[in-house]
């Protein structure tokens, strides 16, 4: 139905504006939910209809027509969000997409020349949709009051139908790879966020804690509680929708996944207004930031590692709980920037902006996760440093991409475990841990290129260095090394599942008194440092001012032993 109409046009992607921008006819019939005007700049043509729009994100126009027994009526015309198959066409050649009501058929086209969407080249006769036929009469938008009334009636019908479809499809959500084609978006993904999202007057913005490509993360307050606010510019509404869709999945509540509070709109100033995700704030910051400043004893390191594995195991797991279906999810961007430290010292996985819902075995019949279009949609995601070899060399198993993406996450997890353990003094009985380094930073520095990573991790099969002293501190002296090697194995199929990582870490959690330390272990192993040796002052909360004027309180990070490296910024989401 309309859900599969290809309302891809309603989801912009944040890519650079093409050099010679395409100009398309712009029209939206009364009553159409959502708008594509954010996909371009409307040109001032006075009161004349149709209007023109200069595309921001593609060089492609689209048109949607409703063909009934006696005429074809234009429903929408405008810019596509990205250049996709069909956009190379010089003319608008519509193809049937849905039957919104008996006796009518929706046709859509994409084309790649200026104003090509003003008219279609031909439509099949209404009785036989999909077969070439004589051209139907083109109804010029705004031709007459009569036309407007007919349109209005039709769209009231359409709206009723749409409403019931949306209700029926509430469980049927589709999620997309950031910046990739949207084969079948969520029914509501085309909603105009500025209308649909409520402002939260009591939400206040304090300080920027991370600036990313698609969003700025603020620390703030909502009803007296500390929150993280992920603010998206309007051009990144697709990224907002994708991440929101994942956070809103039923059953996604877990101690070790950042908690989603609400979606809203607004900003620290009138000019900076856009869609917002309001999330739980973790004042201790990102794993990367934390490890830069603090070392952690064996118990604390294991707590971090175990909670991280638990969070990932939960994400990966497909499950039914309390009658709700939670699909398996691949994170696809696990990095120490995107993992946060909770008050109790455990981890919470954040930034689901690139996460992908995976095909399942037990999903309900109405459930259809996205089938990403082509290998690029699956492969091109994440922070390069943490990308699995099969993503770096584009050999990921596309036959079973769900399992393949889980295994790629496990590789990233292994690098995070290594980063955590590298800052554990108990694993270095002969010396204190060196300053924090990201995985592969020792070998490749702060900003490795994809070529350098490929040469190191794929061609040479090298992995971060594991000191021999790590053998000292575990139930099984080789357990840590074996665990990491089984997670970052060059062979993806040989990697452990997140659940098994959890089990193996749990088995390492308590060094057995009866287990003698190996003779090769220098000076035995030291006692654990006290539990509170890495405690951090709680954030100081100053009075909060309403949304428009940024409020001020400080999210303290504790005394800083050295400045975070450029590669590592403070990031609570």
């Amino acid at each position: 139905m309309l859900g599969s109409l290809g309302l891809w046009a309603l989801l912009p992607t944040a890519v650079e504006a093409p050099p010679n921008r395409r100009t398309c006819v712009f029209f939206e019939a009364p009553g159409v939910r959502g708008s594509t005007k954010t996909l371009g700049e409307l040109l001032d043509t006075g009161t004349e209809l149709p209007r023109a729009i200069r595309c921001l994100y593609s060089r492609c126009c689209f048109g949607i027509w409703n063909l009934t027994q006696d005429r074809a009526q234009v429903e929408m015309q405008g810019c596509r969000d990205s250049d996709e198959p069909g956009c190379e066409s010089l003319h608008c050649d519509p193809s049937p997409r849905a039957h919104p009501s008996p006796g009518s058929t929706l046709f859509t086209c994409s084309c790649g020349t200026d104003f090509c969407n003003a008219n279609y080249s031909h439509l099949p006769p209404p009785g036989s949709p999909g077969t070439p036929g004589s051209q139907g009469p083109q109804a010029a938008p705004g031709e007459s009051i009569w036309m407007a009334l007919v349109l209005l009636g039709l769209f009231l019908l359409l709206l009723l139908l749409l409403g019931s479809i949306i209700l029926a499809l509430l469980q049927r959500k589709n999620y997309r790879v950031r910046g990739e084609p949207v084969p079948e978006p969520r029914p509501d993904s085309g909603r105009d966020w500025s209308v649909e999202l409520q402002e939260l007057p009591e939400l206040c913005f304090s300080q920027v804690i991370r600036e990313g490509g698609h969003a700025v993360v603020w620390a703030g307050q909502l009803q007296g509680k500390l929150v993280a606010i992920k603010a998206f510019p309007p051009r990144s509404v697709a990224q907002f929708q994708a991440e929101r869709a994942l956070y809103e999945l039923p059953g996604l509540q877990h101690d070790h996944i950042v908690r989603f509070i609400t979606a809203s709109r607004g900003g620290p100033g009138r000019l900076l207004s856009g869609p917002l995700l309001v999330l739980e704030l973790h004042p201790k910051g990102s794993l990367c930031h934390y490890l830069t400043q603090y070392t952690s004893d064996w118990g604390s390191s294991l707590r971090m590692a175990l909670s991280l594995a638990q969070g990932l195991a939960f994400l990966h797991e497909e499950r039914w709980q309390n009658g709700q279906y939670k699909p398996g999810i691949a994170h696809r961007d696990l990095s120490s920037q995107n993992v946060l430290i909770r008050e109790d010292g455990s981890c919470a996985i954040g930034d689901l902006g690139l996460a992908l819902v995976l095909p399942g075995l037990t999903q309900p019949p109405a459930w259809t996760p996205t089938q990403p279009q082509g290998p690029a949609a699956i492969m091109e995601a994440g922070t390069q440093r943490y990308m699995a070899p099969e993503l770096l060399d584009k050999t990921l198993d596309l036959q079973d991409w769900g399992m393949a993406l889980r295994r790629a996450d496990i590789y990233s997890l292994a690098l995070l475990l290594w980063e955590i353990l590298s800052r554990c003094p108990d694993l270095r009985p002969d010396s204190s841990p060196p300053p924090f380094q990201l995985a592969y930073e020792a070998e490749l520095g702060n900003t490795p290129t994809s070529d350098e990573l490929w040469a190191l991790a794929v061609q040479e099969r090298r992995r971060p260095y594991i000191p021999s002293t790590w053998r000292c501190f575990a139930t099984d002296p080789d357990g840590l090394r074996e665990l990491l090697e089984d997670c970052w194995d060059a062979d993806p199929e040989a990697r452990l599942t997140a659940e098994c990582v959890q089990q193996r870490l749990a088995a390492l959690a308590h060094p057995q008194e009866s287990h003698p330390f190996p003779e090769s272990c220098p000076r035995g192993c030291p006692p654990l440092c006290p539990e509170d040796c890495t405690s951090i002052p709680a954030p100081t909360i100053l009075p909060c001012r309403p949304q428009r004027s940024a409020c001020h309180f400080s999210v303290q990070q504790g005394p800083c032993s050295r400045n975070p490296q450029p590669a590592c910024t403070l990031s609570p989401v």
Epitope: M403, D478, D486, E493, C500
Partner: antibody, heavy 115, light 106 residues
Framework: QVRLVQSGAEVKKPGASVKVSCKAS????????IHWVRQAPGQRLEWMGW????????KYSQKFQGRVTITRDTSASTAYMELSSLRSEDTAVYYC????????WGQGTLVTVSS | DIQMTQSPSTLSASVGDRVTITCRAS?????IAWYQQKPGKAPKLLTY???SLKSGVPSRFSGSGSGTEFTLTISSLQPDDFATYYC?????????FGGGTKVEIK
């Protein structure tokens, strides 16, 4: 205490199949790979393949591909190795071993192929 | 396949001797493991990776090497050490063992 206990010796005719079992105890069965290694009389050890009980994935040596099938029953914490189209050269002791670089081994199962 | 060639295939030595066994790989490998096997028994892991002794293995055993050449050294041979020793590479499939070195009493 980690233990891998294998099924008893088998005598088979050429062309037949043999299925050897390996019951694991003393650890979480799904947490480690189980590998199968064989040793013909007076010969070197030969790696045959592995199964990862955590997700049931398998990997076989090209030499045995098509003839060997490794399976598992997680409820019984048991892995199985089935070798088909047996020939006299398959006479060997078959070992299961845990995937932490073979730190733990079963006691071995002698399979004799003879007409 | 990566071939692992052990030398010597047989080595006669006396208690107290220093013994060195070599394992050469036909192409570069990251790590190897060494195993000891006694007649009628399953192999026993000695070192992994390359130079780290498995817990409970006496310190007279040591492993070293990189790339294509690896050695296992027994600093002072004990009566319990007379056995056959195998190296294993797991850098690429199929995982391959060396042909074995039998250490016997002189």
């Amino acid at each position: 205490q980690v233990r891998l206990v294998q099924s008893g010796a088998e005598v088979k005719k050429p062309g037949a199949s043999v299925k050897v079992s390996c019951k694991a105890s003393g650890y979480t069965f799904t947490s480690y790979h189980i590998h199968w290694v064989r040793q013909a009389p007076g010969q070197r050890l030969e790696w045959m393949g592995w199964i990862y009980p955590g997700d049931d994935s398998t990997k076989y040596s090209q030499k045995f591909q098509g003839r060997v099938t490794i399976t598992r029953d997680t409820s019984a914490s048991t892995a199985y190795m089935e070798l088909s189209s047996l020939r006299s050269e398959d006479t060997a002791v078959y070992y299961c071993t845990r995937g932490d670089r073979f730190a733990y081994w079963g006691q071995g199962t002698l399979v004799t192929v003879s007409s | 396949d990566i071939q692992m060639t052990q030398s010597p295939s047989t080595l006669s030595a006396s208690v107290g001797d220093r013994v060195t066994i070599t394992c050469r790989a036909s192409s570069s490998v990251r790590y190897i493991a060494w195993y000891q096997q006694k007649p009628g028994k399953a192999p026993k892991l000695l070192t992994y990776p390359t130079s780290s002794l498995k817990s409970g293995v006496p310190s007279r055993f040591s492993g070293s090497g990189s790339g294509t050449e690896f050695t296992l050294t027994i600093s002072s041979l004990q009566p319990d050490d007379f056995a056959t020793y195998y190296c294993l590479q797991w850098s690429s499939y199929p995982w391959t063992f060396g042909g074995g070195t039998k250490v016997e009493i002189k």
